[in-house]
Amino acid sequence: SERCDDWGLDTMRQIQVFEDEPARIKCPLFEHFLKFNYSTAHSAGLTLIWYWTRQDRDLEEPINFRLPENRISKEKDVLWFRPTLLNDTGNYTCMLRNTTYCSKVAFPLEVVQKDSCFNSPMKLPVHKLYIEYGIQRITCPNVDGYFPSSVKPTITWYMGCYKIQNFNNVIPEGMNLSFLIALISNNGNYTCVVTYPENGRTFHLTRTLTVKVVGSPKNAVPPVIHSPNDHVVYEKEPGEELLIPCTVYFSFLMDSRNEVWWTIDGKKPDDITIDVTINESISHSRTEDETRTQILSIKKVTSEDLKRSYVCHARSAKGEVAKAAKVKQKVPAPRYTVELACGFGAT
């Protein structure tokens, strides 16, 4: 066969679908690899061909589009399963070609089983809600294109195993689940089950997402440096180890980059000659507020090092702050035989 532009196995698009449910899978060529859409390709005389490799097999086979009740079909650039079976798992390839042009890409499709409480190996999208922020909604994801707008599906929402009705602070409203006030107790997995008729059959779409309640922008503040502070003085003798923690609290801010860094005499530690190491640890609160600690360490501090300025800096989308550590050289304790004796007037 003639040469074909082979985009390989697109593992970025690890598609997971539930067993015994409809699935519609668009050929990734038009979404991510080619600069034209299916309609353009089709009108230019290009044909879209599908084939697959079963799980744990090497043999590429054509897809059987002649199954009872058209269980697998193709419509434009979409491969349809009505519904999926467990052994549909494998690598699927869509190839666009004519006599002079060929381009193809493969992608893995995994058909996943779920239990009666919707637990499964499916990777779940995470939806963040602001704590105590007023009405916020989650929407049943990835159900577009499964049924025409003339069909009115029934939608049932669950938290974990339990059906949600207008209860406490959550109200189901069709494809939306409205949180009148989001609280930590709302953290968890939410499932919408969409039921719709098609050609005398009833299909179910199950979509689960994780809700994580995070700090509200109403409560967000610029970074707060807890350490260093004015109450602690780092007093060292030359030769001792100097350890200064910089501990910074960051309010949760959606898509904010939180940064902490030290400067020594106004320069980044990498830009100076002294032997300094910095170790960072990060912890999170229940609402994803963040505490970052960077410990600046000089193993054997010199009297020169003890005269330097050590400043902790922090930055988030809310602002930038800095705080200098109080570092000083310890005055050596008097040696009794000489200094002390002199003090008593001994000769």
């Epitope: 105590e132 009405i135 009705q165 207008n166 406490n168 189901p172 409203e173 009148l180 006030i181 609280l183």
Partner: antibody
Framework: EVQLEQSGGGLVQPGGSLRLSCAAS?????????RCWVRQAPGKGLEWVAC?????????YYANWVNGRFTISRDNSKSTLYLQMNSLRAEDTAVYYC???????????WGQGTLVTVSS | ELVMTQSPSSLSASVGDRVTITCQAS??????LAWFQQKPGQAPKLLIY???TLASGVPSRFSGSGSGTEFTLTISSLQPEDFATYYC????????????FGGGTKVEIK
């Protein structure tokens, strides 16, 4: 026995203010319930006024017509719900009920009602 | 703003009759609807929530149905204690959270 005991109604002049109270007994106001006010003008139907969620925080919702004149609040230490009513008008004359429910709007517990009369 | 339209505004019936009251919502409120009963000089009482779920202690002759914009309260066999005014309440959260009562239906003795 679980109940809501109301107080604070009475006669007030137009433009005046009044604070209604609703004390819960037999359960805590801080548990996860909606606490709300509903009113009923003489011989008329029920009209929702406002709600506050007692599970945590103080998110409040008001009917559009309230327009900032009324404020719903709670004091968990006293297990009491309040409705502060300012700039009162004759059309605010009604029996005011406090109501409670696990679901928003699903009021399964009601106070006895207190009459507010706005008249000069 | 959510508007709930209840009909009829009043009806006369006899003990043992089957009575049906309807409520229409101006917006799609799915199943977020409650029915209340109110007797003169008393606070309302919750009968049904989530359009069709019977509240605790409510006799099974009361039933609710519907979803979206059309809802019905049915009393299968009217009893003397059922003569009262009935209100529907719709819950909607499009812009803010909104509760709206219907205008009420007074059920009187024929």
């Amino acid at each position: 026995e679980v109940q809501l005991e109301q107080s604070g109604g009475g006669l007030v002049q137009p433009g005046g203010s009044l604070r209604l109270s609703c004390a819960a007994s037999g359960f805590s106001l801080s548990t996860s319930y909606w606490r709300c006010w509903v009113r009923q003008a003489p011989g008329k139907g029920l009209e929702w006024v406002a709600c506050i969620y007692a599970g945590s925080g103080d998110v409040t919702y008001y009917a559009n017509w309230v327009n900032g004149r009324f404020t719903i609040s709670r004091d968990n230490s006293k297990s009491t719900l309040y409705l502060q009513m300012n700039s009162l008008r004759a059309e605010d004359t009604a029996v005011y009920y406090c109501a409670s429910g696990v679901g928003f709007g699903y009021f399964n517990l009601w106070g006895q009602g207190t009459l507010v009369t706005v008249s000069s | 703003e959510l508007v709930m339209t209840q009909s009829p505004s009043s009806l006369s019936a006899s003990v043992g009759d089957r009575v049906t009251i309807t409520c229409q919502a101006s917006e799609d409120i799915y199943s977020n609807l409650a029915w209340f009963q109110q007797k003169p000089g008393q606070a309302p009482k919750l009968l049904i929530y989530d359009a069709s779920t019977l509240a605790s202690g409510v006799p099974s002759r009361f039933s609710g149905s519907g979803s979206g914009t059309e809802f019905t309260l049915t009393i299968s066999s009217l009893q003397p204690e059922d003569f009262a005014t009935y209100y529907c309440l719709g819950v909607y959260t499009h812009i803010s959270a909104d509760n709206a009562f219907g205008g009420g239906t007074k059920v009187e003795i024929k």
